[in-house]
Interface confidence: medium
């Protein structure tokens, strides 16, 4: 499969476990992948009794679940880890939970940050 309409070159990066994993905590990530495969951005988080705990954000490799998604929307009902992916630069800045089985849509806005570029 070729690149999608909204080609992804950069994503918002975040790692809650940055100290242990010895990475940056947040910034921008340049996406790299194989020539014939699509690239995406993702966001992952937990929801503990209504408190949102961001886990990771970054680049995600070719995944049909992300094709032609301009917004980052998690659709599973009550997962252990919420996950969404999308196509387009920085499309993972905002992320939403909208269960396929119905229920309230919840959108998470990022706090303002001064991102650093990860290469």
């Amino acid at each position: 499969s070729g690149r999608g309409e909204a080609e992804t070159r950069e994503c918002i990066y975040y790692n809650a476990n940055w100290e242990l994993e010895r990475t940056n905590q947040s910034g921008l990530e340049r996406c790299e992948g194989e020539q014939d495969k699509r690239l995406h951005c993702y966001a992952s988080w937990r929801n503990s009794s209504g408190t949102i705990e961001l886990v990771k954000k970054g680049c995600w490799l070719d995944d049909f679940n992300c094709y032609d998604r301009q917004e980052c929307v998690a659709t599973e009902e009550n997962p252990q880890v919420y996950f969404c992916c999308c196509e387009g630069n920085f499309c993972n800045e905002r992320f939403t939970h909208l269960p396929e089985a119905g229920g309230p849509e919840v959108t998470y806005e990022p706090p303002p940050t001064a991102p650093t570029l990860l290469t």
Epitope: K56, D62, N65, T75
Partner: antibody, heavy 117, light 107 residues
């Protein structure tokens, strides 16, 4: 209780075909990607194929591409694996598994044995 | 494709021992790694997801760590029911490849 039950395995000659089924219960089948994994006798696990919840997206391991077809019928809560042009090296226990990609496969069937000889 | 290399391929240990299994990816996979336990004649069972998160119902003596290319599964105090084969799997990029497995045997 969440359950997966495979069927359709058996003995087949090289070049032959088989269709495996996996009946799912206890969860909203159409909301989850489903996967086939196989294990040759005395060997490790090999990922075979995955299909999206809607059935619109599929991926295959290079070893089965062009010979195997994964499909699903969400109205019947059933996953399928159509296996054509079977080879001796396809001999294995075939497992179906549920799970969002990011957390791995959290529910597995008991497996069905395919012997190509 | 991303190759997953597990070591050791087998380990002999006694009840109460601390056992460590390592898994190395041929390229960075962030923390998108799962660990499974398989007993003879049975289907695999998910132990750890996202490199370090314990699957519901799995005893706390199992723990996972690592990020990028190097990962570890630790059994803090081996129990009789833990003698089995353990597999890692990367879930970052299709095909979702497994490691070759580590058999934990009774010493």
């Amino acid at each position: 209780e969440v359950q997966l039950l495979e069927s359709g395995g058996g003995l087949v000659q090289p070049g032959g075909s088989l269709r495996l089924s996996c009946a799912a219960s206890g969860f909203t089948f159409g909301s989850y990607g489903m996967t086939w994994v196989r294990q040759a006798p005395g060997k490790g696990l090999e990922w075979v194929s995955v299909i999206s919840g809607s059935g619109g997206g599929t991926y295959y391991a290079d070893s089965v591409k062009g010979r195997f077809t994964i499909s699903r019928d969400n109205s019947k809560n059933t996953l399928y694996l159509q296996m054509n042009s079977l080879r001796a090296e396809d001999t294995a226990v075939y497992y179906c598994a549920k799970g969002p990609r990011i957390v791995g496969m959290d529910v597995w069937g008991q497996g069905t044995t395919v012997t190509v000889s | 494709d991303i190759q997953m290399t597990q070591s050791p391929s087998s380990v002999s240990a006694s009840v109460g021992d601390r056992v460590t299994i390592t898994c190395r990816a041929s390229q960075g996979i962030s923390s998108w790694l799962a660990w499974y336990q398989q007993k003879p004649g049975k289907a695999p069972k998910l132990l750890i997801y996202a490199a370090s998160s314990l699957q519901s119902g799995v005893p706390s003596r199992f723990s996972g760590s690592g990020s990028g290319t190097d990962f570890t599964l630790t059994i803090s105090s081996l129990q009789p029911e833990d003698f089995a084969t353990y597999y890692c799997q990367q879930v970052f990029s299709y095909p979702l490849t497994f490691g070759g497995g580590t058999k934990v045997e009774i010493k």
